[in-house]
Interface confidence: medium
């Protein structure tokens, strides 16, 4: 038995374009919870298969509403963590589906209104007792980050939760033929005391006081063999006596739980009980080793000689978690300088680099001007990654090669005209304007019009100007 | 496309009574088993009652027997979960829910709820 814990670290807009709007408004506040569904195994499950190792709704978010014109935030969540309880053994392999509800909380007739806003799926390896495992998923241009864990619950202890541990009676070593519970060499393997009475061949417990019972077999101490003709009534309930079968398709109906697994009926499916060895949604795998190869990506698998003893996956540059089965964001740290582009190419690390910049993480700031003349007088200026010339007056262009035509721009104010000159360009005013592009006005008495007006006089009326 | 609609949730005085329908679409309620399953605030979900329409067989959680009743009328491909003596402890959002049943490796068999509408909000207060 054991918990899966999630813990959601944040919700909110994707990197890159499009920032999604805000799910909530002033017209209509908003608040958000998640779900989790969890299922056995890593095979690529359809959205609405049952979440058969369990599932869990987070409380709801505080109130949000969105800031007229603002991108959406992070947005605000809930407290604490989503804990989904497995009562049997940890699989080890599992898929996840993360989902993002938004409550609505505007004046809707008959309640609040809910709404998917992102799902996010994967799968994983994960062995219990391990540290947090951090993720980040991506659902258009939503992005969740999150952390999980499966943890035991005592006494059961080890990668899936099977083993069973109490401590030491005695200081120096374990009861007869049982072991240490390692890595808690001061406990012990507990031995189990089934229920009285249970059958020897035909039970089994996994908690002491407990008798469960293997396929074909029922009845409280797992003595009456199971006949599915002595129903008498066609909806009658089980019966120890007769042995007597539920009529109906029920979750446990021809028990699906294997190696000695036994079944009982959940909200949403059914949980088998497996004996120690053995975990899975049907108890139909025995505890992982090395040779079924669980690490990812190229890892080496060390260790996990019996299924009772741990392995350990030794991950290759650029992978990590227990299984190497996350790949590292290597560009995160941002480790291309001077605005280089970083590629993570899982083998290997490429920065990609501004002009001007070089070395493999762009750390090398080039001499633009080395090698490179500007010509007719000009002078190469540096900056950003690209050399510029300060060309002589009456040239330009990028390398000052290009004979600068001054009056292209039309600088003579008010119709004057343009004359291109050796030392620059020279105005020639239409009458009634002066200065050296013709901005300035000539009053008819032949005094300037200066642009501001003298002392006691109010700007603005020109008639007044001496 | 399977969908489940239900309707009949609101507001209630403890000890009062209210029915919950269960429109089916998209599938014959024959062919499945059907439960109500509800999700309480802080709590986890319970299934509350189920029926395999074709023999009438019904399984109810301990927490509802003898005031709950679920029922199913296969010509109108429906489902209904008459609810009676509610108290405080019943309110919650109660969904319909499908129950597949198929045949796993030869021998034994998988089960599990596959689809569920979008739930409807019984309330139980003075």
């Known amino acids: 038995a054991g918990v899966f814990e999630l813990q959601i670290h944040s919700f909110g807009p994707g990197p890159g374009p499009g920032a999604p709007r805000s799910p909530c408004s002033a017209r209509l506040p908003c608040r958000l919870f998640f779900r989790v569904c969890l299922k056995p195994g890593l095979s690529e499950e359809a959205a609405e298969s049952p979440c058969a190792l369990g599932a869990a709704l987070s409380a709801r978010g505080p109130v949000y509403t969105e800031q007229p014109g603002a991108p959406a935030p992070d947005l605000p969540l809930p407290d604490g963590l989503l804990q989904v309880p497995f009562r049997d053994a940890w699989p080890g392999t599992f898929s996840f589906i993360i989902e993002t509800w938004r409550e609505e909380l505007g004046d809707q007739i008959g309640g609040p209104a809910w709404s998917l806003l992102a799902r996010v799926a994967g799968r994983r390896r994960l062995a219990a007792g391990g540290p947090w495992a951090r993720d980040i998923q991506r659902a258009g241009a939503w992005e969740l980050r999150f952390s999980y864990r499966a943890r035991c619950e005592p006494p059961a202890v080890g990668t899936a939760c099977t083993r069973l541990c109490r401590p030491r009676s005695a200081p120096s070593r374990c009861g007869p033929g049982l072991r240490p519970c390692a890595p808690l060499e001061d406990e012990c393997e507990a031995p189990l005391v089934c229920r009285a009475g249970c059958s020897p061949e035909h039970g089994f417990c996994e908690q002491p006081g407990e008798c469960r019972c293997l396929e074909g077999w029922t009845g409280p101490l797992c003595t009456v063999p199971v006949s599915t003709s002595s129903c008498l009534s066609p909806r009658g309930p089980s019966s120890a006596t007769t042995g007597c079968l539920v009529p109906g398709p029920g979750p446990c109906d021809g028990n699906p739980c294997a190696n000695g697994g036994s079944c009982s009926e959940t909200p949403r499916s059914f949980e088998c009980t497996c004996p120690r060895g053995f975990y899975g949604l049907r108890c139909e795998v025995s505890g992982v080793t090395c040779a079924d190869g669980p690490c990812f990506n190229g890892g080496l698998c060390v260790g996990g000689a019996d299924p009772d003893s741990a392995y350990i996956c030794h991950c290759p540059p650029g992978f990590q978690g227990s299984n190497c089965e996350k790949r590292v964001d290597r560009c995160s740290l941002q480790p291309c300088r001077n605005g280089g582009l970083c590629l993570d190419l899982g083998h290997a690390l490429r920065c990609r680099c501004r002009a001007g910049f070089a070395g493999p993480r762009c750390e090398h700031d080039l001499d633009d001007c080395a090698g490179r003349a500007c010509a007719n007088g000009g002078t190469c200026v540096e900056g950003g990654g690209a050399h510029r010339c300060s060309c002589a007056l009456g040239f330009g262009g990028r390398d000052c090669r290009e004979r600068a035509d001054p009056c292209a721009a039309r600088p003579c104010a008010h119709g004057g005209r343009c004359y291109a000159h050796f030392s620059g360009l020279v105005c020639a005013c239409a009458p009634g304007y002066m200065g050296a592009r013709c901005e300035f006005p000539v009053h008819p008495d032949g005094a300037s019009a200066l642009p501001a007006a003298p002392p006691g006089l109010r700007p603005g009326d020109p008639q007044r100007y001496l | 496309e399977v969908q489940l609609v239900e309707s009949g949730g609101g507001l209630v005085q403890p000890g009062g009574s209210l029915r919950l329908s269960c429109a089916a679409s998209?599938?014959?309620?024959?062919?499945?088993?059907i439960g109500w399953v509800r999700h309480a605030p802080g709590k986890g979900e319970e299934l509350v009652a189920r029926?395999?329409?074709?023999?009438?067989?019904?399984r109810y959680a301990d927490s509802v027997k003898g005031r709950f009743t679920i029922s199913a009328d296969t010509s109108k491909n429906t489902a209904y979960l008459q609810m009676n003596s509610l108290r405080a402890e019943d309110t919650a959002v109660y969904y319909c829910?499908?129950?597949?049943?198929?045949?796993?490796?030869?021998?034994?068999?998988?089960?599990?709820?596959?689809?569920s509408g979008q739930g409807t909000l019984v309330t139980v207060s003075s």
């Open positions: 829910a499908r129950h597949h049943y198929s045949h796993y490796d030869g021998h034994s068999h998988y089960y599990g709820l596959d689809y």
């Open positions: 029926i395999y329409p074709t023999n009438g067989y019904t």
């Open positions: 998209g599938f014959n309620i024959s062919h499945y088993s």
